[in-house]
């Protein structure tokens, strides 16, 4: 088809443009370029033929034009007026015609434009600020940049007049900045000169330096005052209410006791007409004083109170030292010291923080030591500890129970025997037990200070029986090669053998097998899959001997490297394709499959009917287990043969 | 593409038995195994039991044991679900589901389900 | 048998609204757990399994987190279109056993 492709589409003004024809009928007798969407005699403007290579203008023909063999036509030195529809009329040599019809846009060369403002020194949080991008141009698009970057999304930036206008509310000394406007059109894209805004602002509250307010007789005094403050703050000075000067250090030599007393700095913006004092009190010290811990906590609670540790009193140029247990202090994350080394905080204190701490002031010729400082900190009560920890007892023996609940103040305790209360001691004594005596022993551990209690309770059983003992372990699904398992024969009794079994069979010897606390607990390192196995503790005593049920361990592990079976790797074409993929894995492997490295189904048997050579390529098996973490693939390549008489072809399942 | 189309809905009383069917197509039926879940009336999902339609393999919950028997035709690929001795707290929408894989996958395709009402 | 406790049972909240439904195992399942929608009058559609794979063609606003015993479901911009109940499912060995479900609603 006959189609007009204009280069460019977009044309600025006094450059040219070229009307492109494609696929360009053959056997022509010549052609004719129109002005619009249709042929129109009083609209050409160039008709060419091919016979005699002749080109005549028509009416609409303005002497820019070049019409070229091809049939494509050149408008050069474009004007607003070009803008528009082209048609071109062919005609063949059997005299039928064809047409087709193009378009391009002419924009101006934009100028380069310019901001103008509606206020050049707005007052913070008082005034609004207008930016209009001059000229106003049609057909533009208009862009504003702040310190080169795009505008920030903000609710004080308002854009209004298609773009053209940028309006900043409540005007804040963070607007400072530079800004820069931008028009484009299709064919252009200028960019204004930047503006910057010069925001009043201030003065802010001044800040006086240095900020440590005690001195020692004889030195030199050198305040310094700022406040932030557009146009720069003018500064003045008073002492004890007395105007001294109108400057921003202010610096008296050589000061004794009397210089004491409230200093003052005023800063004033004469622009905005504003005021901002700050007044700091200045102490000078005859000699320098004996330091002197203070806290801001006497009690702290553990693990939910900080404690702040100041060394008295502050002193220019001084070197603060600190102590703690005798020892200068230790690096840790809970121990932070100020800037100036005068205040040691303690976070999240805990019962091992108890100090002492000192402090030392360095002076030119020793240091001063302040009074050690313990600190007081409330924990507890813990879960109590009711020993011994036997649970089994035979009848006739004494009982006897010792509790202890580490708490700051100590604990107050409590015993209760099946939810009655007995005494109010730590230990607890019955003589010449029975089978009655068999019940919930619970201690009850009380600290007065923090209200907080906790309790233990122990099943004391009074039997000449052994009970049936059971396994408890510390790790029910433990990972092959990572984990560790511990097994405990329960319950713990006094007098009594513990003995074990794996499969019926006593312990193997094994560098991985351990048995401690009295052959009461039996611990296996790095399981394997083989220790998947049954496990029995026994107990037995002069009276009497018993077994556990059997706990079978369940090892986690794989996904071991698959195995895709069958084997074959070359097949003829029309077989069917049945791989089987198989990992040993507990839980049983997620199976997925790839060909070609693209995904395919999540089964263990990949069936393909009647492949053909277009089913060559790689087959992956992926195999994946969560509950160990791991995964684990294998890749096979599969040929597959047009021809039937290949030796050492699979037939296919 | 894949579908299950099971049975219609059936009505049966106390102590009878129902055999619901689940016909399977557009994959490989042998490849993927296939569960059984129902719904009581404005309940949740309860998961009943699956087979394997490749060897015939099947597990049931603990709760169904001794009343649900599952079979399978890979002539017709449809597999069965029989629940004997219903009792009314049997009326359910009983829903056949395709495993997106094999071993330790979630349900990828349903049937529609089938509405087995139990009443005297 | 492994318990799946869900929660809430049900929830209100407006289109946009990020709404988060949590799923608790009574026994670690790793991270074989899957979630599903269902609408009224229609089976359950798998979303999300192993915890955090989004099933295909389902929308990226839904997504999954967690592994062990606890477990969320997230829909970052809630729709009128994802009225429906959710059930969370454990995938670990049979048997496969169900969260009661949480009935989400458009306030």
């Known amino acids: 088809k006959l189609t007009i492709e204009s280069t460019p589409f977009n044309v600025a003004e006094g450059k040219e443009v070229l009307l492109l024809v494609h696929n360009l009928p053959q056997h022509l007798f010549g052609y004719s370029w129109y002005k619009g969407e249709r042929v129109d005699g009083n609209r050409q403007i160039i008709g060419y033929v091919i016979g005699t290579q002749q080109a005549t203008p028509g009416p609409a023909y303005s002497g820019r034009e070049i019409i070229y063999p091809n049939a494509s036509l050149l408008i050069q030195n474009i004007i607003q007026n070009d803008t528009g529809f082209y048609t071109l009329h062919v005609i063949k040599s059997d005299l039928v015609n064809e047409e087709a019809t193009g378009q391009f846009r002419v924009y101006p060369e934009l100028p380069k434009p310019s901001i103008s403002s509606n206020n050049s020194k707005p007052v913070e949080d008082k005034d609004a600020v207008a930016f209009t991008c001059e000229p106003e141009t049609q057909d533009a698009t208009y862009l504003w940049w702040v310190n080169n970057q795009s505008l920030p999304v903000s609710p004080r930036l308002q854009l209004s007049n298609g773009n053209r206008t940028l309006t900043l509310f409540n005007v804040t000394r963070n607007d400072t900045a530079s800004y820069k406007c931008e028009t484009q059109n299709p064919v252009s894209a200028r960019r204004s000169d930047s503006v910057i805004l010069n925001v009043l602002y201030g003065p802010d509250a001044p800040t006086i330096s240095p900020l440590n307010t005690s001195y020692r007789s004889g030195e030199n005094l050198n305040l310094s005052c700022h406040a932030a403050s557009n146009p720069p703050a003018q500064y003045s000075w008073f002492v004890n209410g007395t105007f001294q000067q109108s400057t921003q250090e202010l610096f008296i030599p050589n000061i004794t006791v009397n210089n004491s007393g409230s200093y003052t700095c005023q800063a004033h913006n004469s622009d905005t007409g504003l005021n901002r004092t700050t007044v700091t009190t200045i102490t000078v010290y005859a000699e320098p004083p004996k330091p002197f811990i203070t806290s801001n906590n006497s009690n702290p609670v553990e693990d939910e109170d900080a404690v702040a540790l100041t060394c008295e009193p502050e002193i220019q140029n001084t070197t603060y030292l600190w102590w703690v247990n005798n020892q200068s202090l230790p690096v840790s994350p809970r121990l932070q010291l100020s800037n100036d080394n005068r205040t040691l905080t303690l976070l999240s204190v805990t019962r091992n923080d108890v100090g002492p701490y000192e402090c030392g002031i360095q002076n030119e010729l020793s240091v001063d030591h302040s009074d050690p400082v313990i600190l007081n900190v409330l924990y507890g009560p813990d879960d109590p500890t009711i020993s011994p920890s036997y649970t089994y007892y035979r009848p006739g023996v004494n009982l006897s129970l010792s509790c202890h609940a580490a708490s700051n103040p100590p604990a107050q305790y409590s015993w209760l025997i099946d939810g009655n209360i007995q005494q109010h001691t730590q230990e607890l004594f019955i003589s010449n037990i029975t089978e009655k005596n068999s019940g919930l022993y619970t201690c009850q551990a009380n600290n007065s200070a923090s209200g907080h209690s906790r309790t233990t309770v122990k099943t004391i059983t009074v039997s000449a029986e052994l009970p049936k003992p059971s396994i408890s372990s510390n790790n029910s699904k433990p990972v092959e090669d990572k984990d560790a398992v511990a097994f405990t024969c329960e319950p713990e009794a006094q007098n009594t053998t513990y003995l074990w079994w794996v499969n019926g069979q006593s312990l193997p010897v094994s560098p991985r097998l351990q048995l401690s606390n009295g052959n009461r607990t039996l611990t296996l390192f790095n399981v394997t899959r083989n220790d998947a196995r049954a496990y029995v503790c026994g107990i037995q005593n002069s009276v009497s001997a018993n077994r556990s049920d059997p706990v079978t361990l369940d090892v986690l592990y794989g996904p071991d490297t698959p195995i895709i079976s069958p084997p074959d790797s070359s097949y003829l074409s029309g077989a069917n394709l049945n791989l089987s993929c198989h990992s040993a894995s507990n839980p049983s492997p997620q199976y997925s499959w790839r060909i070609n490295g693209i995904p395919q189904q999540h089964t263990q048997v990949l069936f393909i009917a009647k492949i053909t050579p277009n089913n060559n390529g790689t087959y992956a098996c992926f195999v994946s287990n969560l509950a160990t973490g791991r995964n684990n693939s294998i890749v096979k390549s599969i040929t597959v043969s047009a021809s039937g008489t290949s030796p050492g072809l699979s037939a296919g399942a | 593409q894949v579908q299950l189309v099971q049975s219609g809905a059936e009505v049966k009383k106390p102590g009878a038995s129902v055999k619901v069917s689940c016909k399977a197509s557009?994959?490989?039926?042998?490849?993927?195994?296939l569960h059984w879940v129902r719904q009581a009336p404005g309940q949740g999902l309860e998961w009943i039991g699956y087979i394997n339609p490749q060897t015939g393999y099947t597990s049931y919950a603990q709760k169904f044991q001794g009343r649900v028997t599952m079979t399978r035709d890979t002539s017709t690929s449809t597999v069965y679900m029989e629940l004997s001795s219903l009792r009314s707290e049997d009326t359910a929408v009983y829903y056949c589901a395709r495993e997106y894989g094999n071993y330790n996958y979630p349900l990828d395709y349903w049937g529609q389900g089938t509405l087995v009402t139990v009443s005297s | 048998d492994i318990q799946m406790t869900q929660s809430p049972s049900s929830l209100s909240a407006s289109v946009g609204d990020r709404v988060t439904i949590t799923c608790r195992a009574s026994?670690?399942?790793?991270?074989?757990l899957a979630w599903y929608q269902q609408k009224p009058g229609k089976v359950p559609k798998l979303l999300i399994y192993?915890?955090?794979n989004l099933v295909e063609g389902v929308p990226s606003r839904f997504s999954g987190s967690g592994s062990g015993t606890d477990f969320t479901l997230t829909i970052s911009s809630l729709q009128p279109e994802d009225v429906a109940t959710y059930y969370c499912?454990?995938?670990?060995?049979?048997?496969?056993?169900f969260g009661q479900g949480t009935k989400v609603e458009i306030k």
């Open positions: 192993n915890a955090k």
């Open positions: 026994e670690n399942i790793y991270g074989y």
């Open positions: 557009g994959y490989i039926f042998t490849s993927y195994w």
């Open positions: 499912q454990h995938h670990y060995g049979t048997p496969y056993t």
